[in-house]
């Protein structure tokens, strides 16, 4: 999916108002220094591509984060503010959600959510630069 035509201001507002709080809640009990940020992004569409991938694509040690509250809110935000996102992405992410086995917050999942926080912060920084 090409995130170029998204309403970035609206996405930023949703992130700051609600998604960020759920990410931080998920990470509660860990320190920001516990994980190194290895994933980066260069512009707003690229940041959203990476956020989408890390949130909804299962990885070997973190089956899927798609059922978490921050993921549901991310999906809702992208559906609202990115034209055509629902039509091209929702069925794919629903299938990934079904693949999830058990709800265990592993260290690998914490690391993945830490990367997500970094990507979102980067998204907002690139937004500020453009204004």
């Amino acid at each position: 999916y090409d995130f170029t035509n998204c309403d970035f201001q609206k996405i930023e507002a949703d992130y700051l108002r609600t998604i960020s709080k759920d990410l931080i809640t998920y990470m509660s009990g860990t320190k920001s220094t516990d994980f190194n940020n290895t994933v980066s992004c260069s512009n707003r569409p690229h940041c959203l591509t990476e956020i989408q991938s890390l949130t909804f694509n299962p990885t070997p040690r973190c089956a899927s984060l798609a059922k978490e509250m921050f993921a549901r809110k991310t999906k809702a935000t992208l559906a609202l503010w990115c034209p055509g996102y629902s039509e091209t992405q929702i069925n794919a992410t629903q299938a990934m959600k079904k693949a999830r086995k058990s709800k265990v917050t592993t260290n690998k999942c914490l690391e993945q959510v830490s990367q997500l926080l970094g990507l979102w912060r980067r998204f907002i920084r690139t937004l500020l630069k453009k204004q």
Partner: antibody, heavy 120, light 111 residues
Framework: QVQLVQSGAEVKKPGSSVKVSCKAS????????INWVRQAPGQGLEWLGV????????IYAEKFQGRVTITADTSTSTAYMELSSLRSEDTAVYYC?????????????WGQGTLVTVSS | QSALTQPPSASGSPGQSVTISCTGT?????????VSWYQQHPGKAPKLMIY???KRPSGVPDRFSGSKSGNTASLTVSGLQAEDEADYYC???????????FGGGTKLTVL
Amino acid sequence: QVQLVQSGAEVKKPGSSVKVSCKASGFTFGSYGINWVRQAPGQGLEWLGVIVPLVGVTIYAEKFQGRVTITADTSTSTAYMELSSLRSEDTAVYYCARGQEYFYWYFDLWGQGTLVTVSS
Amino acid sequence: QSALTQPPSASGSPGQSVTISCTGTSSDIGGYDRVSWYQQHPGKAPKLMIYGVSKRPSGVPDRFSGSKSGNTASLTVSGLQAEDEADYYCSSYASGHTFGLFGGGTKLTVL
């Protein structure tokens, strides 16, 4: 069962406000959009706005911006639509309608409608 | 945005097919595959018949079908039955985050 139940008919004076409620049951209220649509007597359908409780987003039709307020109480699975500065042209049946999860612009479940009459 | 354009009336005999058109612009119908159709019987709430241009919700007979070409969407009702007599409204998502840009409605009469 899966349904939207709206509050009863209202008669209002021009210049006043009206608040219509819409109680959801049988589905996860927060995940869907709750849209508001009105229909004046003998006329077509007109979209007023939507709320998506999951992310706390409200979007209003340009025509009603500043005059309509849509809110939701997730603890009671109830959405509200308040329309202010009423005029006779606002006389209509007001419907709440569920927007599909992540496809909030398809209205797959409707309330029974609330008749709002604006008359002096 | 101005409302989508529908013919005020359409008619057909039982068993026949009838097509209702809905014309918009590149900012609504032409720009998104987010067209839906609603059936409304007198004194009742509307009912979703078609969404996503051509998808049918469960419970809607396959006699109802939808399509789109450019800025115009169409609803076809084949094998007309008496209970199909109702008002039909098209709706489209429109730029500027308008979730329900409706047509003026078409009164379908089964002769």
